[in-house]
């Protein structure tokens, strides 16, 4: 099942000359600290089935564990949203669902999971080594995605294990709001060291109650930079398209197509790695969203008439407020 | 006031295609969804899918796919929708609408109709 | 699809009376988050477009008279029109507008005596 990083437990020092209020003191920067590692980490899992009872029809789950309220959740298949993928069902949690074909049922398990349906026959079918991807926008984390396909040899009515394997970028209000918190956090943790550094420090002991359990790890900035861009797509496979991108609009297709750039980052690079590789979901730098190329007045590359620009589809008035209200 | 003004009735044979015009007024119109809803005496009021003008994003009921195209012209505020290979089940009024500001799918305003007969 | 029953297909009433039409969903319509039913009633006078009265169940668009209230929760829903007019001669339908693809009801047609 998910393998999640886990904190160790916290081991206060013997109680001594300090008495009850050095105690204390001792205390807070370990829980500040601990805050420190863990606070602005959400993760995203993915979970896709396939019926057993109909080899075209695909079931994906998909959950945010984060602290932040979720502002929209996007599923996507074959690559994701800004990267090739088309958008098979937007959820918005004050508006409704907006689904495109062959998604049949897109719903809220949760007020942090969602699900979504997948039945199709011909050009729109999902395929076996299809990839799915939902991305969560949320406040103040930002936006957060995560892909998964089933394994290559996976039977039919087998699931997929939910995969926490994000791809590391968050919006720049997700990392100003969350970094504010933290650079706070951290600053005040170090002035709190400073004036115990004369101290006998408290030891990180693992828990007692799962001493296998692994050590929570935070990444800094130029290391979650760098897996970004390492982190490698699943392969798509192109006949599993869905058939939205070719007859949308057979009378004078989007001319643009042929023209945009294309991001060497988003490429896929190899086959898929996303339901075995779980990768901790850790803050990055700001990667180039689908509002930022609609700014601009581009199109997201790859982006097919099933795709919408922005992160609410109801396009950049909606980021005004939480309705999109005028 | 926000307005929806469709192009007038239509007699088409057999086979044929047309193309159904819904202009809009009073609003900004690349920000607002614009559906198409058929009805018929005895079926009620059916989706047929819905635009988003300036974005090329549109969304079709599967049941209309191949049966409806939707453009939208931005620079005239108005919206589109083609009918190919048109029988008589196509006879029915068209209705453009627009999508609310509160919910993805409630309609707030919407065209006076378009009435389409397909006759031999 | 959310499939959308209305009962009954029509009624006659007289001026003054109190109206009340049903609307049943064929899965719940309530959302988790702002415990709202998305659900909307439109009237359609004859030989005209329908008009948005409620939405999310229970809320009136602007310009709608009170007497027109909206209720009902998850599946069941009804319209009531207290003090019905002559004016309110009309076909209503009830849809939802939680999910693709957005689904009516057949109608319920309203006649005065």
């Known amino acids: 099942m998910r393998t999640e990083a886990q904190v160790p437990a916290l081991q206060p020092p013997e109680p001594g000359l300090e008495g009850a209020m050095g105690h204390r003191t001792l205390v807070l920067p370990w829980v500040l600290l601990t805050l420190c590692v863990t606070a602005g980490t959400p993760e995203v899992w993915v979970q896709v089935r396939m019926e057993a009872t109909e080899l075209s029809s695909f079931t994906i789950r998909c959950g945010f564990l984060g602290s932040g309220s979720i502002s929209l959740v996007t599923v996507s298949w074959g690559g994701p949203n800004g990267a090739g993928g088309t958008t098979l069902a937007v959820l918005h949690p004050e508006r409704g669902i907006r689904q495109w074909a062959p998604a049949r049922q897109a719903r809220w398990e949760t007020q942090s999971s969602i699900s979504l349906i997948l039945e199709g026959s011909g050009a729109s079918s999902p395929c076996a080594n299809t990839t799915f991807c939902c991305k969560f926008a949320s406040f103040p984390e930002g936006s957060w995605e995560a892909c998964g396909s089933l394994p290559p040899s996976s039977d039919p009515g087998l699931s997929a294990p939910p995969t926490p394997a994000p791809i590391l970028r968050a919006d720049l209000a997700g990392i100003l709001g969350v970094s504010g918190v933290l650079l706070f956090g951290c600053v005040y943790l170090l002035h709190l060291l400073r004036r115990h550094k004369h101290r006998p420090a408290p030891r990180l002991q693992p828990s007692r109650t799962s001493p296998q359990a692994p050590r929570a790890r935070a990444w800094a900035p130029s290391q979650a930079s760098q897996a970004a861009l390492h982190v490698p797509y699943a392969t798509i496979n192109t006949s599993c398209r869905p058939a939205t991108l070719d007859t949308a609009h057979p009378h004078g297709g989007p001319s643009w197509w042929a023209s945009l750039p294309t991001h060497a980052a988003h490429r896929p690079q190899g086959p898929a790695a996303w339901a075995s590789t779980p990768i901790p979901a850790r803050g990055s730098f700001v990667s180039v969203e689908n509002g930022l190329y609609a700014q601009a007045g581009e199109r997201p590359p790859h982006t097919g008439p099933g795709l919408t620009l922005f992160p609410d589809p109801r396009g950049p008035r909606a980021m005004e407020g939480p309705l999109g209200v005028r | 006031q926000v307005q929806l003004q469709q192009s007038g009735a239509e007699l088409m044979k057999p086979g044929s295609s047309v193309n159904l015009s819904c202009k809009a007024t009073d609003y900004t119109f690349t920000d607002y969804w614009i559906n198409w809803v058929k009805q018929r005496p005895g079926h009620g009021l059916e989706w047929i899918g819905e635009?988003?003008?300036?974005?090329?994003?549109?969304n079709y009921n599967e049941k209309f796919r191949g049966k409806a195209t939707f453009t939208a012209d931005t620079s005239s505020n108005t919206a589109y929708m083609q009918l190919s290979s048109l029988t008589s089940e196509d006879s029915a009024v068209y209705f453009c609408?627009?999508?609310?500001?509160?919910?993805?799918?409630?309609?707030?305003?919407w065209g006076q109709g378009t009435s389409v007969t397909v006759s031999s | 699809d959310i499939v959308m029953t209305q009962s009954p297909s029509s009624l006659a009433m007289s001026v003054g009376q109190k109206v009340t039409m049903s609307c049943k969903s064929s899965q719940s319509l309530l959302n988790i988050f702002n415990q709202k039913n998305f659900l909307a009633w439109y009237q359609q006078k004859p030989g005209q477009s329908p008009k948005l009265l409620v939405y999310f169940a229970s809320t009136r668009e602007s310009g709608v008279p009170d007497r027109f209230i909206g209720s009902g929760s998850g599946t069941d829903f009804t319209l009531t029109i207290s003090n019905v007019q002559a004016e309110d001669l009309a076909d209503y339908f009830c849809q939802q507008h939680y999910s693709t693809p957005p689904t009516f009801g057949g109608g319920t047609k309203l006649e005065i005596k």
């Open positions: 609408a627009r999508g609310s500001d509160y919910s993805y799918y409630a309609m707030d305003y």
């Open positions: 635009i988003l003008p300036g974005s090329v994003t549109t």
